[in-house]
Interface confidence: low
């Protein structure tokens, strides 16, 4: 007998608003395989079961996060495969302040990523870059996390803000700094970048 899950990964990241189908199938040497998904929250996707296969459709809602397990059995023999589903939101919505930097004076720069999920410091990281390198001498302050005001009800999205206390930019001043925000997900790394021009 054969037991297959497609996609075969044990962890899957799904962008909010996009759909994903996970197909679990099994064939038996004799008789028809019984295949079903278990460990599903009532709101986690919809399941279409066919002889020998079961299709879990995830709609890319934040409530779809979970770890369903596909179970296939031939008679008394059974096999299982769990899939950790993480729904994420990481739009390109970075806001920096101030809009530009002034050389020759100390200043504080903030960078805010809006409408994100998960709002987890372990999965989201900020960097202040000069070219492709982190800006030396920039002092990272305590990050802040706030719930976004939602137009419609649902699982809340968050905004995360990182501030840095900058040293005086030397002369000649660089043309710009960049705030870079990286979201690290299972087998997926996403990055957004926003320029902060320097007045010349």
């Amino acid at each position: 007998q054969s037991f297959q899950v497609n996609p075969p990964e044990s962890e899957v990241a799904v962008a909010m608003g996009t759909s994903l189908q996970i197909t679990c199938s099994m064939s038996c040497d004799e008789g028809v395989a019984r295949v079903h998904w278990r460990g599903l929250d009532t709101s986690l996707g919809s399941v279409q079961t066919l002889p020998g296969s079961s299709i879990l459709s995830v709609r890319g809602m934040l409530s779809d996060t979970g770890t369903p397990v596909c179970v296939g059995s031939c008679g008394s023999r059974s096999f299982q495969h769990s899939v950790k589903i993480l729904v994420y939101a990481f739009p390109d919505q970075l806001v920096v302040s101030p809009e530009f930097l002034v050389p020759g004076q100390d200043q504080v720069v903030s960078c805010t990523a809006h409408n994100i999920w998960p709002a987890d410091p372990n999965s989201l990281s900020f960097a202040l870059l000069l070219g492709e390198q982190r800006l030396e001498g920039a002092q990272a302050l305590e990050p802040e996390q706030e719930e976004e005001i939602q137009e419609a009800e649902g699982t809340p999205l968050f905004r995360m803000t990182q501030r840095w206390r900058l040293p005086s930019l030397g002369t000649p001043a660089p043309p710009a700094l960049h705030c870079q925000v990286t979201m690290q997900l299972p087998k997926l790394v996403l990055t957004h970048r926003k320029e902060i021009p320097v007045l010349q």
Epitope: G39, V69, V71, S76, R77, S78, F79, Q80, H81
Partner: antibody, heavy 121, light 107 residues
Framework: QVQLVQSGAEVKKPGASVKVSCKAS????????ISWVRQAPGQGLEWMGW????????NYAQKFQGRVTMTRDTSTSTVYMELSSLRSEDTAVYYC??????????????WGQGTLVTVSS | DIQMTQSPSSLSASVGDRVTITCQAS??????LNWYQQKPGKAPKLLIY???SLQSGVPSRFSGSGSGTDFTLTISSLQPEDFATYYC?????????FGQGTKVEIK
Amino acid sequence: QVQLVQSGAEVKKPGASVKVSCKASGGTFSSSAISWVRQAPGQGLEWMGWISAYNGYTNYAQKFQGRVTMTRDTSTSTVYMELSSLRSEDTAVYYCASRVHSGGSYPDDYWGQGTLVTVSS
Amino acid sequence: DIQMTQSPSSLSASVGDRVTITCQASEHIYNYLNWYQQKPGKAPKLLIYAASSLQSGVPSRFSGSGSGTDFTLTISSLQPEDFATYYCQQTDSIPITFGQGTKVEIK
């Protein structure tokens, strides 16, 4: 009746690795998944992960990710659990347990006798 | 992770007593709930699976009930061999988690 027989007690130094074996007999090895559960002295039960004897698929608890490796040898119906970078808090009895499909629930029906791993300098 | 909270953590009872142990899950786990008995120096032994199904060979004085988040293990008439530690376990989602245990002692 499935029987799970584990390897003997081990004493290890901090930073070392330990590999515990669990040999299955009396059942269809390839249809089972083997869980590993540990119990520190005087403490409760802690699930570490499982391995499918059928296809070698593993699923580890986040806490042990990167330190634990579960493997199987179908020719000898044996599964192995290797834990690396040992520290004193890894001192525990380590159990293997066979997970058997039963009416939509997956209870650990059969357990090994346990292997005491002591981590001490 | 799903947290499993057992109560009480210990209890004293006499032979013949009716004993009830509760287990609460931090999330809805349907009936993916098992109960184990463990005696000192021994491996756990499965008593109840799927919240209320009695495992083969387990005396009928043991029973389980509940679904969703609240579950109960009942020993209708405590016997001398029942003095042990009892654990609930959820298998609804990975990682599988156990309650902290309930120790049943002789009064």
